[in-house]
Amino acid sequence: GITIPRNPGCPNSEDKNFPRTVMVNLNIHNRNTNTNPKRSSDYYNRSTSPWNLHRNEDPERYPSVIWEAKCRHLGCINADGNVDYHMNSVPIQQEILVLRREPPHCPNSFRLEKILVSVGCTCVTPIVHHVA
Amino acid sequence: GITIPRNPGCPNSEDKNFPRTVMVNLNIHNRNTNTNPKRSSDYYNRSTSPWNLHRNEDPERYPSVIWEAKCRHLGCINADGNVDYHMNSVPIQQEILVLRREPPHCPNSFRLEKILVSVGCTCVTPIVHHVA
């Protein structure tokens, strides 16, 4: 759709790569000011498909630290607190935007990158393949 | 920590806002080339805490269109296929980076922004508060 007329205060866009190369202000604005930081911090333990969080660090990436979920069990926790292997714990994966320094080790030049992260786990009914 | 020495081929950084304003190439690089695109597409239906995706549009954001998860039930689906309200379906939320046009309506100038998105749902044991 059409957006409002271009703001006359916009930076110059005569770059030959425009609009593929853009200016980005890294002072992150957080729109989640009224959210509770402990919001889902205990779901990893209380879930029927519990998970652990693992630290992933990469100094050439922004953000440099990302926490990744790994399901604790192949099955899911039943009402008795035991692992039920008739159900499956699976990671919910998401592709997220990060900035990758490009050229490498440059402090002020980045490229957008999509990386796949596991955010948590959910319990699903398995797909059963019947052999004829 | 200490980063690798600066690459001599880096773009000029004499901007008065450096290093807060950087150049970003929007030609997204995907590091997940060997993954199966159908990987998690049916978990939303097979989960004991199923979810639907809802469309959210914002032309001042990049990406402009985001489909977000909303849990279908308060409870979780039991072995009989019924909703068990002794358990809770809860959204797994994550903060992700997006780009916000700044100044508004500029095609080539952005600010990094963190937004909270619900990625999927998981089934958790409820926290029971006993009244004295």
Epitope: P19 | N32, Y43, V65, I66, W67, A69
Partner: antibody
Framework: EVQLLESGGGLVQPGGSLRLSCAAS????????MLWVRQAPGKGLEWVSV????????HYADSVKGRFTISRDNSKNTLYLQMNSLRAEDTAVYYC?????????????????????????WGQGTTVTVSS | QSELTQPPSVSGAPGQRVTISCSGD????????VSWYQQLPGTAPKLLID???QRPSGVPDRFSGSKSGTSASLAISGPQSEDEADYYC???????????FGGGTKLTVL
């Protein structure tokens, strides 16, 4: 060449059912949200439904909610519209259209996000006539 | 509102500038992007103006779009006979969780 080809229209009695198909070619179907739009004889365009890239998200116009079901098979590059309990007022030419290359938080996708978007590809339409 | 508001018809000579208005509210035009579609008689609609006022390849530069508040407009500078068609605006509506179209405007080239 990017193309959408609808089929499945025809004459049906009130209360009957029809299933429309839309075969996509020339683009990566699984990256895009897809829509159905209809046009009654001598009338304007009316949006019917939209589906997210993985199929996990759907929205419907109030006029068809509970009667029509949108779905997709990304392995076959095909979009569907199952129409039940058809009424005389459903008589129209039905078009499928390609929407935004959008971001789904709970599934992986493989394109860059559309910098500009809209229903940029339309099929030729298939006619549905509901009459006794 | 379930439909965006457009004038039923407009007309203009090849030397004139013709504008088609599209009025909505804060849940559609006021917040989200507006796109414009051209439908020639007996054919499927075609995207004419996309977000950020972009014209898909093949759309002549005599077509342009703008938006202010809850209203958008399509301008045709020097309409040609081949531009005689129905024109529709559309936007995503947050309240309805769906796309809303305008009622359509028939352009007659004098």
């Amino acid at each position: 060449e990017v193309q959408l080809l609808e089929s499945g229209g025809g004459l049906v009695q009130p209360g009957g059912s029809l299933r429309l198909s839309c075969a996509a070619s020339g683009f990566t179907f699984s990256h895009y949200e897809m829509l159905w739009v209809r046009q009654a004889p001598g009338k304007g365009l009316e949006w019917v439904s939209v589906i997210s890239p993985s199929g996990g998200g759907t929205h419907y116009a109030d006029s068809v909610k509970g009667r029509f079901t949108i779905s997709r098979d990304n392995s076959k590059n095909t979009l569907y519209l199952q129409m039940n309990s058809l009424r005389a007022e459903d008589t129209a030419v039905y078009y499928c259209a390609r929407g935004s290359e959008s971001f789904e938080v709970s599934s992986s996708w493989y394109g860059g996000w559309d910098y500009y978007y809209g229903m940029d590809v339309w099929g030729q339409g298939t006619t549905v006539t509901v009459s006794s | 509102q379930s439909e965006l508001t457009q004038p039923p018809s407009v007309s203009g000579a090849p030397g004139q500038r013709v504008t088609i208005s599209c009025s909505g509210d804060t849940s559609n035009v006021g917040k989200n992007a507006v796109s414009w579609y051209q439908q020639l008689p007996g054919t499927a609609p075609k995207l004419l103006i996309d977000s950020n006022n972009q014209r898909p390849s093949g759309v002549p530069d005599r077509f342009s779009g703008s938006k202010s508040g809850t209203s958008a407009s399509l301008a045709i500078s020097g309409p040609q006979s081949e531009d005689e068609a129905d024109y529709y605006c559309a936007a995503w509506d947050d309240s309805l969780s769906g796309v809303v179209f305008g009622g359509g405007t028939k352009l007659t080239v004098l």
